[in-house]
């Protein structure tokens, strides 16, 4: 109620002889400040005097003086809220009740605190979790209801008398609520800790033993097992017997069931601590263990690897990789179940033993077609030699080999013939599926690997074929050697280099571009008349009569070819000039007379000149000289001269006679 002073402090404090007591304490007076404080030991209220009797351990007065005998007890409080006390050292006879007599100006109060001082240091108390399981972390707590600033202590953990390696966390409390020292240890117990003694030891600052508490660990764990095997190395041969025994070295709580496992799978009807295997087979090789269960769970023994030894089984060959491409790498692996592992291998290629090959693997760095075939092997160990298995087939793939282009026709081939070629090869893997031909043409392929060229051209020189599977292999080109009549026959003038003038030396050449066979004959012809049989036609001194249309022929064993007609043109100065007169060389005066200068010239006459009997040139330059009307004075001899680019020619004299007309005669 509101008429009480309010105090807070631990209800009881514990200590031992020679230690100290620190009493945390707070208060709140009803009115004003504290004026008087007396600490009693076991105070008794005296009704007669209305005062408390008892040993006064501490007394403070208004002037604040403290008697010298009170040095052991110290009031560490103040006048309004702190009432903390210290007793150092504390003695056994300090046990009992401490009375704090507080007086303010108008109010009084007696506060009681219990003090329990033991003769020797009292033991700490170990607190354990309700259940401890192996490998599960637990916290062990050691609690001592003591702490005092003037008396340092330490708590140490021991397991079977040996300090524990794990780090403990120590904490102290000196508060109005509680006074204690506590050590906490985090610890993962193993099954082997079961039944072991854990000690919490109280020591002074120098590590001197003061007291301790001990507990026995009850670590729940699955059964711990040991497996024993006869024979001890667990290596036997087919037909031998094997005994395995399972021993429980520890179980908490007690075990309930037993079973045996092989390669992790439970063996049926095997629920005793002994496993008997009679006349073992190789299938019984494996990892064995026993399993025993309790309420915590199943425990398993270590595994025993039972090896049932046997001679190698029939072997198989694994090829990496088949089919293989020529030139690539290949590896063979001989696989055979055996125990112990095979120590020696014998390899066979197409049934023939490969000398010097005794390893499990055979490596070919560069495969060739001759490596193809069936590979088999035999494995051998200390117990015997296995059988040869069926073997594995190595397929070596390669491009077609020795490809040739073959001409099927009888030779020689003539232009226009139908030519048949075939593409042949020696071997191929995989099979040839198609063929290619060079050069490409609009040719027939009547069947695979056969080429038909209809109407073969003179210029079809070489043909090559390729046989193809996954790869193409080309043959060397084959020459068709097509025979044909001479081609592009033409007449060519060799000399002179310029135009042909009458009297020149002239050479004509019969040219052709090609001929197969090369041996040829030549023929020259003019107007259907044979002129010569050489490649050249020569004229020492050409005459205009040699002009005309010439052809040459070239022939070989295949046929003959004519050139186009070639016109030979001879240039010459005007010749055979003569003056012709029309209507005649006798003309009556008054009539018309026409003189014509006739000539033979190449090129034709370009310019004419007329002359009279006095060799006087007349002012006329055309081919015809027209006299109209003709006069008697015109009578006389005339001649003409013709000119072309080559030269000039003149005619002989031609006489014109002009006679008088009857009229003139009549007038005379």
């Amino acid at each position: 109620d509101s008429s009480k002073w309010v105090f807070e402090h631990p209800e009881t404090l514990y200590a031992w002889e020679g230690a100290c007591v620190w009493i945390p304490c707070t208060y709140r007076a009803l009115d004003g400040d504290l004026e008087s404080f007396i600490l009693f030991h076991n105070p008794e209220y005296n009704k007669n005097t209305s005062k408390f009797d008892g040993t006064r351990l501490y007394e403070s007065t208004k002037d604040g003086k403290v008697p010298s005998e009170q040095k052991r007890v110290q009031f560490l409080g103040d006048k309004n809220k702190n009432c903390t006390l210290s007793i150092h050292p504390v003695h056994l006879n300090d046990s009992g009740q401490l009375g704090l007599r507080m007086e303010s100006k108008t109010e009084k109060w007696m506060e009681r605190i219990h003090l329990n001082v033991s003769e020797r240091p009292f033991p700490p108390h170990i607190q354990l979790p309700p259940e401890i399981q192996e490998s599960q972390e637990v916290t062990l707590t050691c609690l001592l209801n003591f702490s005092c600033y003037g008396y340092p202590i330490q708590l140490q953990w021991l397991l079977e008398g040996v300090p524990m390696r794990q780090a403990a966390v120590t904490s102290t409390s000196l508060t109005i609520k509680s006074v204690f020292t506590r050590s906490e240890l985090k610890f993962s117990p193993q099954w082997s800790h079961h039944g072991k003694i854990v000690t919490c030891q109280l020591q002074d600052a120098d590590g001197k033993f003061l007291s301790n508490d001990t507990v026995q660990l009850n670590v729940k764990h699955t059964p711990k097992l040991e497996i024993k095997v006869t024979p001890s190395d667990a290596i036997v041969r087919e037909g031998d017997s094997v005994t395995m025994t399972c021993e429980v070295s520890s179980s908490n709580p007690e075990y309930t069931t037993v079973s045996w496992l092989k390669d992790g799978t439970s063996l049926k009807k095997q629920n005793t601590f002994t496993l008997n295997l009679r006349e073992v087979t190789k299938d019984q090789s494996g990892k064995y263990c026993c399993q025993v269960s309790n309420d915590v769970g199943p425990g398993r023994s270590e595994e025993v690897f039972l090896q049932v030894q046997y001679a190698p089984e029939p072997s198989t060959v694994q090829i990496l990789h088949s089919p293989a491409v020529e030139g690539s790498q290949v590896e063979f692996l001989c696989m055979s179940l055996a125990n112990p592992l095979p120590t020696n291998y014998t390899w066979y290629h197409n049934g023939k033993e490969m000398q010097g090959r005794t390893e499990e693997k055979v490596h070919i760095p560069k495969i060739l077609p001759w490596h193809a075939g069936t590979y088999s092997c035999v494995a051998e160990n200390i117990l015997g030699t296995g059988q040869r298995g069926p073997g594995a087939e190595l397929d070596v793939q390669y491009p077609p080999k020795k490809v040739t282009t073959v001409i099927q026709n009888p030779m020689p081939i003539r232009e226009g013939d139908t030519v048949t070629l075939s593409c042949n090869y020696n071997s191929s893997n995989p099979s040839v599926t198609r063929y290619e031909w060079k050069p490409h043409g609009a040719w027939e392929e009547p069947s695979l690997g056969v080429l038909k060229i209809q109407n073969v051209g003179w210029d079809n020189t070489t043909i090559a074929c390729a046989a193809c599977n996954s790869w193409c292999s080309w043959a060397s080109p084959v020459a068709l050697n097509v025979q044909y009549a001479p081609r592009d026959v033409r007449v060519r003038k060799i000399k002179p280099l310029s135009e042909i003038h009458s009297g020149n030396s002239v050479s004509l050449q019969c040219d052709f571009s090609s001929s197969h066979p090369k041996e040829v004959q030549f023929f020259w012809e003019k107007n259907g008349r044979l002129l010569g049989k050489e490649s050249q036609l020569n004229f020492d001194s050409i005459s205009p009569e040699d002009a005309g249309s010439y052809s040459c022929w070239v022939n070989n064993s295949i046929g003959q070819t004519a050139s186009k007609a070639w016109t030979l043109e001879v240039l010459y100065a005007p010749r055979r000039l003569r003056v012709s007169m029309s209507p005649g060389d006798q003309v009556m005066e008054g009539k018309s007379a026409t003189l014509t200068c006739e000539s033979d010239a190449n090129p034709p006459v370009s310019h004419y000149t007329w002359f009279d009997w006095n060799n006087q040139s007349l002012p006329y330059h055309s081919q015809k000289l027209r006299l109209e009307p003709v006069k008697v004075q015109h009578s006389g001899a005339y001649w003409c001269q013709g000119t072309n680019s080559v030269g000039k020619g003149r005619s002989p004299l031609s006489t014109l006679t002009v006679y008088y007309s009857p009229e003139t005669i009549g007038r005379r």
Partner: nanobody
Framework: QVQLVESGGGLVQAGGSLRLSCAAS????????MGWFRQAPGQERRFVAG????????VYADSVKGRFTLSRDNAKNTVHLQMNSLKPEDTAVYYC???????????????WGQGTQVTVSS
């Protein structure tokens, strides 16, 4: 085309040495195996020694073990048969042959050299 050319044969005194060589060209070189055989007059061809081009050690007939040494020179596509402590019974025509593997039977060899005469006189 495969060609095998032997060389190094000749006449030697008993206890002497000879070195036979076999040069391979074409398919026989570089991959597969080379074998040496010998044929004494009136007898069958018998296996003497063999070696693979790519890997592995040589293989010898019991009659020549410890006396003959077979080696290969891959760079020159040549195998050499070093014959020491020669005996008169080693007299024969020596042939080199090519096959995919070292076989002991001459029937399993596809290509043969022309042979070289070795005569050991006592």
């Amino acid at each position: 085309q495969v060609q095998l050319v032997e060389s190094g044969g000749g006449l030697v005194q008993a206890g002497g040495s000879l070195r036979l060589s076999c040069a391979a060209s074409g398919r026989a070189s570089g991959s597969g195996a080379m074998g040496w055989f010998r044929q004494a007059p009136g007898q069958e061809r018998r296996f003497v020694a063999g070696i693979e081009w790519s890997s592995g050690g040589p293989v010898y007939a019991d009659s020549v073990k410890g006396r003959f040494t077979l080696s290969r020179d891959n760079a020159k596509n040549t195998v050499h048969l070093q014959m020491n402590s020669l005996k008169p019974e080693d007299t024969a025509v020596y042939y080199c042959a090519a096959a995919p593997w070292v076989f002991s039977s001459p029937d399993d060899y596809m290509y043969w050299g022309q042979g070289t005469q070795v005569t050991v006189s006592s």
